[in-house]
């Protein structure tokens, strides 16, 4: 059998491979050792088996999209049944205390590989015997601690495959600057250690995305507004754009990125360096926003111009596949910029709201009967912006952080927004009082400590903003 | 949708050399190599090279190593193929095609650009 | 390079029967064979891909089989649209190449 018949459901071509070419990976026309790494087809019954007191699942992510040209990076963590996990010396044992189907286990080991390793028998004076070799027949490479990871993992895209050895979690990056660009499909094959051969105890596959448009996020937050993401922001208040853009493996951290906005308002063109800005939208409407994003990346070098049509310049013809795979133009091998774009746009809105709010006077109401250690306290509040339809008060300790008490009573005002609003609080002491008011789309905070003195007619309020 | 559009037909002498446009539309232009394959009268289909629009690395069928050289303009999302040392039996309808991401079979083609070498 | 024989060249069938056209290449290709329709004056039709995927639109009177060397267009009810050169043409490494045609007829 050939690598592409146990990895892949088809024949990848040479095609595939040639326009593909992944550094330090192998094509997957080479064969696979089957004595050593029994192939089993989906539904065989020898998969059940295949893992004690259970089935082990493969979890396969990446850091897709990726800009060509970036490293993009997998990583495979393997999920034990329940009670189960991986030990410092890389053996399965049963979490203490932990309870299964099969009840709690006599034995701490579900695979106790330091023992067999210790057993194993016919290896030479390097550590190395014929059943420490990856599917192809390579030797395991033997890093500090080698013996301790038990796990075979062989990665297959593109025609080529990439074989690791690793215990219950391994990474792989993989550059993409000769990948086509679209969407791959990335499959990997788990294999477990089984004496002196090896057992599939998984298999699992993923989408991932080369791009060259960098991927470009942006949030988008204002103060007073009530639901960021609806993308409804309020009029005359600056709306705060962070552009964030997917570069896990920081290829752009060298490149000069120009933002270049234009905000829909016919406000003309804003281009910055700094990946955010504020911007206020002075009318009501709705708006498209659009954002470019230039940065100067590292690329491929646009070839050297053709020779002169006569005489004829030799060149070397285009071999078997894998002599010269691509018959490429040259390609010189210097430190080329090309200009990559990101794009971003966003349909917003943009509404009334309430813009400011203010406590403007505090005063203690004399009750006739006054309650036993208990005080009200009117706030004179102002508003600027939208009419509120709701007020809510949050009285807590001087520090702001533990509530006691949080009201939110329905309000009618008028246009001139002046309303008064009557809290009451037991006890004297220091209080802090947040009051907000708010509308269906925002919502509009002011704070202020406040001193409530002994129920003492002579004592007056005092209220610190 | 995907569109290829070439440049018109062409006469030229032996010895001259012609320059075929393939301009493409409907799709991200650099995301797929450009395929060109030639007719002659009455015959059948021939592979003459490709290019890749994102890095224009090509790829050259031997018969035409040295005689042909394929272009590409970004900017306006044209691939050119200039054939050199034209001689009579360059006589033939030239196709663009596109690839299909990694897979070299064609599923849209150039209208075709019949060029004639005649003295 | 791989060599691509297509037979038969011609091929003569009546409306409504079976008309199967057969490619040879030198080395496995296997499953990276396509196979076009081209009738004259228009540029080449995509109808299989992969030796045995239909391309979408293609109707499903058209079908290909084969793997190894050995691959099998089949049309199995001729129409009188279906009068065209097939050609097929192996996409699994570079050079690209196409076989000679095949041209079908109503009998």
């Known amino acids: 059998k050939r690598f592409h018949d146990v990895l892949g459901n088809e024949r990848p071509s040479a095609y595939m491979r040639e326009h593909n070419q992944l550094n330090g990976w192998s094509s997957d026309e080479n064969d696979w050792n089957e004595k050593l790494y029994p192939v089993w087809k989906r539904g065989d019954m020898r998969w059940k088996n295949s893992w004690k007191g259970g089935r082990v699942q493969a979890v396969l992510t990446s850091d897709s999209p990726a800009l060509v040209g970036s490293n993009i990076t997998f990583v495979v963590n393997l999920v034990f049944p329940r009670c189960q996990k991986e030990d410092a010396n890389g053996n399965i044992v049963y979490e203490k205390n932990c309870r299964n189907e099969a009840g709690l286990s006599a034995d701490p080991y579900v695979y106790n590989w330091t023992a067999w390793s210790e057993d194993s028998d016919g290896e030479n004076g390097t550590g190395q015997s014929h059943h420490n070799v990856f599917p192809d027949g390579k030797p395991f490479p033997h890093h500090p601690g080698w013996r301790r990871w038990n796990f075979v993992y062989v990665f297959h895209t593109l025609g080529q495959y990439f074989q690791k050895l690793g215990r219950c979690s391994v990474r792989v990056s993989v550059n993409t600057a000769n990948v086509t660009l679209g969407p791959q499909l990335m499959e990997v094959t788990v294999y477990r250690r089984h004496g002196r051969a090896y057992v599939p105890i998984a298999q699992v596959k993923d989408v991932y995305v080369v791009t060259d448009q960098i991927p470009v996020f942006v949030t988008m937050s204002q103060k007073n507004d009530r639901n960021s993401s609806d993308e409804t922001f309020l009029k005359d208040l600056p709306i705060t754009f962070d552009v964030l853009i997917h570069d896990p493996s920081h290829f752009l951290n060298y490149s000069t990125i120009n933002y270049k906005w234009s905000f829909g308002d016919n406000t003309g063109l804003f281009v910055s360096i700094n990946h955010t800005v504020n911007h206020t939208y002075v009318l009501n409407g709705t708006f498209s926003l659009n954002l470019t994003v230039k940065a100067a990346a590292p690329g491929p070098c646009p070839p050297p111009p053709p020779p002169p049509p006569r005489p004829p310049k030799p060149t070397p013809s285009l071999g078997p596949a894998g002599d010269n795979p691509l018959g490429l133009s040259e390609i010189p091998d210097e430190n080329c910029q090309i200009n990559r774009y990101g794009h971003f746009q966003a349909t917003i809105t943009i509404v009334e709201g309430i813009l400011e709010v203010n406590i403007i006077q505090t005063t203690d109401v004399l009750m006739l009967v006054p309650g036993p250690d208990s005080s009200l306290i009117d706030f004179v509040v102002t508003c600027q912006g939208s009419i509120p339809t709701e007020v809510c008060t949050i009285i807590s300790d001087p520090t702001c952080e533990i509530t006691q008490n949080a009201v939110c009573s329905p309000v009618d005002v008028d246009e001139m927004c002046l309303l008064t609003v009557r809290r009451a609080f037991n006890g004297s002491g220091t209080y802090c009082v947040n009051l907000t008011l708010g509308d269906d789309t925002s919502l509009a905070l002011t704070s202020t400590l406040i001193s409530v003195p002994d129920r003492d007619p002579a004592s007056s309020l005092r209220m610190a903003n | 949708q995907v569109q290829l559009v070439q440049s018109g037909a062409e006469v030229k002498k032996p010895g001259a050399s012609v320059k075929v446009s393939c301009k493409a539309s409907g799709y991200t232009f650099t995301s797929y190599w450009m395929h060109w394959v030639r007719q002659a009268p009455g015959q059948g289909l021939e592979w003459m090279g490709e290019i890749n629009p994102y890095d224009q690395r090509t790829n050259y069928a031997q018969k035409f190593q040295g005689r042909v050289t394929m272009t590409v303009d970004k900017s306006t999302s044209t691939v050119y193929m200039e054939l050199s040392s034209l001689r009579s039996e360059d006589t033939a309808v030239y196709y663009c095609?596109?690839?299909?991401?990694?897979?070299?079979?064609?599923?849209?083609w150039g209208q075709g650009t019949l060029v004639t070498v005649s003295s | 390079d791989i060599v691509m024989t297509q037979s038969p060249d011609s091929l003569a069938v009546s409306l409504g029967e079976r008309a199967t056209i057969n490619c040879k290449t030198s080395q496995d290709v296997s499953p990276s064979l396509a196979w076009y329709q081209q009738k004259p004056g228009q540029p080449p039709k995509l109808l299989i891909y992969?030796?045995?995927k239909r391309y979408t639109g293609v109707p499903d009177r058209f079908s290909g089989s084969g793997s190894g060397t050995d691959f099998t267009l089949t049309i199995s009810s001729l129409q009188a649209e279906d009068v065209a050169v097939y050609y097929c043409q192996q996409h699994y490494s570079i050079p690209l190449q196409f076989g000679g045609g095949t041209k079908v007829e109503i009998k």
């Open positions: 992969s030796a045995s």
């Open positions: 095609a596109r690839s299909t991401g990694n897979y070299a079979w064609f599923a849209y």
